[in-house]
Amino acid sequence: QGGAAEGVQIQIIYFNLETVQVTWNASKYSRTNLTFHYRFNGDEAYDQCTNYLLQEGHTSGCLLDAEQRDDILYFSIRNGTHPVFTASRWMVYYLKPSSPKHVRFSWHQDAVTVTCSDLSYGDLLYEVQYRSPFDTEWQSKQENTCNVTIEGLDAEKCYSFWVRVKAMEDVYGPDTYPSDWSEVTCWQRGEIRDACAETPTPPKPKLSK
């Protein structure tokens, strides 16, 4: 998302359709307090940022309340009165949904249903990843709502789970960000565990009849 204008690189993240974070990296102005000016309507005057992000004592970004705002952010990064980067962007291209909340697990024999609170907007995918110490990679399953059933689990194994939310590419484009992962939770025989042993425990011998 960065720009070539005067060597200024920018990054935009639209957190959960609520807050926009614009950060910049401008080597030419590394010891300068650049200012950030913005508007959500092309007809309005620019406002200056009131919530700057600082890096090594100098401005490096701005956090904006953008809840229920129009789709377009018009902004200008300036050195004094001189604009060093000016752009207008559809904010939703840079959507990052919030991390899943109220994650719950419901076990029934060799299957688990993972649920969480659906976000208030649509066109999202809720992804559950899981693995046991026997697995070399995470397995994944995703659904359009936060109600994901995973079948074919081994009740004797310990499984680690975590959940995240992704914006559908067909709707929001390919340059969005997935949410942060929920905390990892570990389960074995339908009960929560502190952790799954890194070394897989050998299977119990079958008792001869």
Partner: antibody, heavy 122, light 107 residues
Framework: QIQLQESGPGLVKPSQSLSLTCSVT??????????WTWIRQFPGKKLEWMGY???????YYNPSLKSRISITRDTSKNQFLLHLNSVTTEDTATYYC??????????????WGQGTLVTVSS | DVVLTQTPATLSAIPGERVTMTCKAS??????LHWYQHRPNETPRLLIK???RSITGIPSRFSGSGSGTDFTLGINNLEAEDFAIYYC?????????FGSGTKLEIN
């Protein structure tokens, strides 16, 4: 199969208004998630996006035209309309209507009309 | 506005060849860059969306690549119907903008 067809006068006098209609068949313009747009191509082949109207009636206009442009729709006829005021010879172009890809974010244009040439001349 | 610069302005080739053309954006636009083909007296046609994603019904000899500011459209095994003007278009910047076009002509 969606089809778009532009219609309107081929000749407009300077300072007058230009009005064009895009008739859509095979697809409803109120289908959620789709935006409907006007794009023009100048005689030198340069393309310019003019504006959108959404499934929800929301409009967006090119800032370079904002004071002169209006896009409306007539859902009963499944049409959307372009109005451009105070035209000059610089507005001579082929005008296309188009549909944007599904998705809020107006992305690319996957269905276009054949285009209609509008000449501004006295 | 995001300015898109297409090169070359004109490209001469013969059927059966492979050609590439480029589109350079004045600001980084991720992968939200789309390609169109416009043949004379026809309606423009979307070829590639989001830099490299294929479109249903478009022959597989058309391919796209790139991200950030530099993008490429490639056409393998040129056919007579491919001689046309090709435009790139960006969508994250407002307003959406098009490149000035590359005219692919028969040598």
């Amino acid at each position: 199969q969606i089809q778009l067809q532009e219609s309107g006068p081929g000749l407009v006098k300077p300072s007058q208004s230009l009005s064009l209609t895009c008739s859509v068949t095979g697809f409803s313009i109120t289908t959620s998630g789709y935006y409907w747009t006007w794009i023009r191509q100048f005689p030198g082949k340069k393309l310019e996006w003019m504006g959108y109207i959404g499934y929800n009636s929301k409009t967006y206009y090119n800032p370079s035209l904002k004071s002169r442009i209006s896009i409306t729709r007539d859902t009963s006829k499944n049409q959307f309309l372009l109005h451009l005021n105070s035209v000059t010879t610089e507005d001579t172009a082929t005008y296309y209507c188009a549909r944007s890809l599904y998705g809020g974010y107006k992305d690319a244009f996957d269905s276009w009309g054949q285009g209609t040439l509008v000449t501004v001349s006295s | 506005d995001v300015v898109l610069t297409q090169t070359p302005a004109t490209l001469s080739a013969i059927p059966g060849e492979r050609v590439t053309m480029t589109c350079k954006a004045s600001q980084s636009i991720g992968t939200s860059l789309h390609w169109y083909q416009h043949r004379p007296n026809e309606t423009p046609r979307l070829l590639i969306k989001f830099a490299s994603r294929s479109i249903t019904g478009i022959p597989s000899r058309f391919s796209g690549s790139g991200s950030g500011t530099d993008f490429t459209l490639g056409i393998n095994n040129l056919e007579a119907e491919d001689f046309a003007i090709y435009y790139c278009q960006q969508s994250p910047g407002f307003p959406p903008t098009f490149g000035s076009g590359t005219k692919l002509e028969i040598n």
